[in-house]
């Protein structure tokens, strides 16, 4: 048979061109990409490949070593001068490792038939590649009809005798894919039908999307799908200390590329993202929610001595409302309002003040008015009670003024203006207020209500009474109006500084109507209700003193 070098003997050694070719070619063989997993690489097998040639005088292995003395497994065949060639080379069993689509990369050289004298009728420039699926590692079968053809392989570039002389080796690389595979493994077969071929390397691999961490989600090594257009949806798992609202997913393409990310993981509260991992917030820092990017310093007047803090603790005498966000500074109650002034108008008081010097760090300052009625003699104060009205209101005042109406006249009051804010109710400290003492103006007194009859004679009636419930000032005098019953238009008026009088010059056995009113500097009050008393008959004795009902 013809040798590849063009001599017609059958050399047992590798011809020169093979050495030249391999030394050049092997230097160019690079490591496989990270998304390719080799099932077989003839270049890396140290011992016997365990391949079978059939018939035995067809394909032959050329034992060579590279510059590092590693064996090179090269198979060649060059029976271009003989008719009806059918030379088969069968690989050992190759596990597909769960892949349903595999790729076969062939590196080979092929002699140009035109450069071979006398072999034009029988010389071929192609060879065929087949596969046979099997679960059995020992099931190598050489029945040709059981093998499925993958493709006819032609060279992009063939070489001539001239190339040999110039030592220019034209190494072809062809890749074919096979799938879907359904069994645990397979055999490959190379059929020569009369070409001059050197099969330099066979690499069988599958593609995977390599494990990756993206958006804090770990996506595992994923073998690509059987279909070349298929996108496999892969669920990611969140890295330590991370959580997700939307489970992370990515799609693994047939080319072993990750595409179309959906969802993401976020570092949980108390952790932040650094270099694709979730790192703990250090003491002094916190992160309240997964949705916040990074740990932040504790806000003013707060601290944390923990790692992984989700909030900070308020310093002594500082507080945080439940509704305050954890990013807000801790705050304290305000100081007292300042410069309170009052303006009295009869039984109304208008108070005005300026805000506290220290609002406690809050904007929600409001004011509360406490009203106390004080006894000027005893110095004892009591709550004012419900009759006092506050305009616009008693508590929750936003403005720095208030009007109190319906106060008692000529009464000592103490008003406490307290500043409060959102944390005042959380503080055990003393109330912060400013006090204002006022005395309301005198007003007309209330009616006299309690009148007693004294000595009653035939021509006179003596009366006594108590000061009105609400004198509304200093009582200057009383005015007593009386008339004979049913003769209202003819009345008499007596004035008295005391709470007793005697009406004289009355008719015996007659009924008289009395009304009394008091006067202060502010004027007269209204008359009391009518009180009726009867003088005695001419011969009767004086009556005893008794209270009129």
């Amino acid at each position: 048979p013809a040798s590849l070098a063009g001599c017609y003997s059958a050399p047992r050694r590798a011809p020169l061109w093979t050495c030249l070719l391999l030394c050049a070619a092997l230097r160019t063989l690079l490591a496989s990409p990270s998304n390719e997993v080799n099932l077989l690489d003839s270049r890396t097998v140290m011992g016997d490949l365990g391949w079978i040639a059939f018939p035995k005088n067809g394909w032959e292995e050329i034992g060579e070593v590279d510059e590092n003395y590693a064996p090179i497994h090269t198979y060649q065949v060059c029976k271009v001068m003989e008719q009806n060639q059918n030379n088969w080379l069968l690989t050992s069993w190759i596990s597909n490792e769960g892949a349903s689509r595999i790729f076969i990369e062939l590196k080979f050289t092929l002699r140009d038939c035109n450069s071979l004298p006398g072999g034009l009728g029988t010389c071929k420039e192609t060879f065929n590649m087949y596969y046979f699926e099997s679960d059995d590692q020992n099931g190598r079968n050489i029945k040709e009809n059981q093998y499925i053809k993958i493709d006819t392989i032609a060279a992009d570039e063939s070489f001539t005798e001239l190339d040999l002389g110039d030592r220019v080796m034209k190494l072809n690389t062809e890749v074919r894919d096979v799938g879907p595979l359904s069994k645990k493994g397979f055999y490959l077969a190379f059929q020569d039908v009369g070409a001059c071929i050197a099969l330099v390397s066979v690499r069988v691999y599958y593609k995977k999307c390599p494990s990756v961490v993206r958006h804090l989600a770990v996506f595992p090594d994923t073998i690509t799908g059987a279909d070349s257009s298929q996108l496999l949806e892969v669920s990611g798992s969140c890295v330590n200390h991370s959580v997700t609202d939307e489970p992370p997913k990515m799609h693994c393409s047939a080319e072993g590329e990750w595409l179309v990310p959906i969802g993401k993981c976020m570092c949980k509260a108390g952790y932040e993202e650094k270099n694709g991992t979730c790192q703990v917030c250090r003491p002094g820092f916190f992160k309240a929610s997964p949705h916040i990017q990074s740990c932040g310093k504790c806000p003013p007047h707060s601290y944390t001595h923990e790692e992984a803090s989700t909030s900070c603790v308020c310093e002594k005498d500082y507080f945080r409302r439940e509704s305050d966000p954890p990013t807000m500074a801790c705050t304290r109650p305000p100081s007292a309002p300042r410069n309170a002034i009052s303006n009295v108008n009869e039984t109304s008081v208008f108070l005005e003040w300026i805000p506290p010097a220290d609002t406690g760090g809050r904007k929600d300052v409001s004011y509360y008015i406490a009203c106390k009625k004080c006894n000027s003699h005893a110095g004892v104060c009591e709550e004012c009670g419900g009759h006092v009205r506050y305009l616009p209101r008693q508590s929750g005042l936003k403005n720095t003024s208030v009007m109190m109406v319906d106060l008692l006249a000529h009464t000592n009051y103490t008003f406490e203006i307290e500043a409060v804010n959102g944390v005042s109710d959380l503080s055990p400290g003393a109330r912060q207020y400013v006090s204002v003492n006022v005395t309301t103006n005198q007003a007309a007194p209330s009616p006299v209500t309690n009148v007693k009859k004294g000595k009653i004679a035939k021509n006179s009636i003596s009366l006594s009474w108590q000061e009105p419930d609400r004198p509304n000032g200093i009582i200057l005098e009383y005015e007593i109006k009386y008339f004979e019953k049913d003769q209202e238009t003819s009345y008499t008026i007596i004035k008295s500084k005391e709470t007793t009088i005697t009406a004289e010059g009355l008719k015996p056995a007659s009924v008289y109507v009395f009304q009394i009113r008091a006067r202060t500097a502010a004027g007269y009050g209204v008359f009391s209700r009518r009180f009726e008393f009867e003088t005695t008959p001419v011969f009767a004795a004086s009556s005893d003193q008794s209270q009129i009902p």
Epitope: P283, G284, Y303, H305, E306, V313
Partner: antibody, heavy 120, light 111 residues
Framework: EVTLVESGGGLVQPGGSRKLSCAAS????????IHWVRQAPGKGLEWVAY????????YYADTVKGRFTISRDNSKNTLYLQMNSLRSEDTAMYYC?????????????WGQGTSVTVSS | DIVMTQSPGSLAVSLGQRATISCKAS??????????MNWYQQKPGQPPKLLIY???NLESGIPARFSGSGSGTDFTLNIHPVEEEDAASYYC?????????FGSGTKLEIK
């Protein structure tokens, strides 16, 4: 008023054990990290261990790691340092100190210390 | 571990003059814009007292004649004007990284 009072010191044989206590008052103990710091006679300060208020964060100096254990009982306002496999080089005045609240935190209050002597 | 190298080991300063103590960290003690460097004063028979935290912040109740400066690896404690009561040992400490190491100390004597 913030006070820290250490106790439990004394003479211990090499290889022996001792448990130090630190009683705290005048502040909300459970929210404060506390440190143990020691000082060998005539020498400088050496940081020993730290525990956060909720005991979630604990650190040790390399020289005591595996031999000393820091712990606390917030219900008793007390910090502890369990010292095992004691060596002569552990002889020192042991102070407990409170982590401060002004950032970045220093050790703002210290106890008066308790003396531990490791000798045969 | 971060090693804190303090210098000088001791110094004598006249009353009213300036005392300067240096502390050098074997690696930066800064984090997020803050320097985790503290200074303490210790008098014989007493526990240490915090003077400066965060390299330059004066602890409450400490006289303003104490000041701290520096960032990264180089820090300084200044006392000016020095008073009689300032005679003590001074220690720097980093709290950026566990273990929280102290410097070897500087003994200040008043002349």
């Amino acid at each position: 008023e913030v006070t820290l009072v250490e106790s439990g010191g004394g003479l211990v044989q090499p290889g022996g054990s001792r448990k130090l206590s630190c009683a705290a008052s005048g502040f909300t103990f459970s929210t404060f990290g506390i440190h143990w710091v020691r000082q060998a006679p005539g020498k400088g300060l050496e940081w020993v261990a730290y525990i956060s208020g909720a005991s979630t964060t604990i650190y040790y100096a390399d020289t005591v790691k595996g031999r000393f254990t820091i712990s606390r009982d917030n219900s008793k306002n007390t910090l502890y340092l369990q010292m095992n496999s004691l060596r002569s080089e552990d002889t020192a005045m042991y102070y407990c100190a409170r982590y401060g609240t002004s950032f970045p935190y220093g050790l703002d209050y210290w106890g008066q210390g308790t003396s531990v002597t490791v000798s045969s | 571990d971060i090693v804190m190298t303090q210098s000088p080991g001791s110094l004598a300063v006249s009353l009213g003059q300036r005392a300067t103590i240096s502390c050098k960290a074997s690696q930066s003690v800064d984090y997020d814009g803050d320097s985790y460097m503290n200074w303490y004063q210790q008098k014989p028979g007493q526990p240490p007292k915090l003077l400066i935290y965060g390299a330059s912040n004066l602890e409450s109740g400490i006289p303003a004649r104490f000041s701290g400066s520096g960032s990264g690896t180089d820090f300084t404690l200044n006392i000016h004007p020095v008073e009689e009561e300032d005679a003590a040992s001074y220690y720097c400490q980093q709290s950026n990284e566990d273990p929280f190491t102290f410097g070897s100390g500087t003994k200040l004597e008043i002349k």
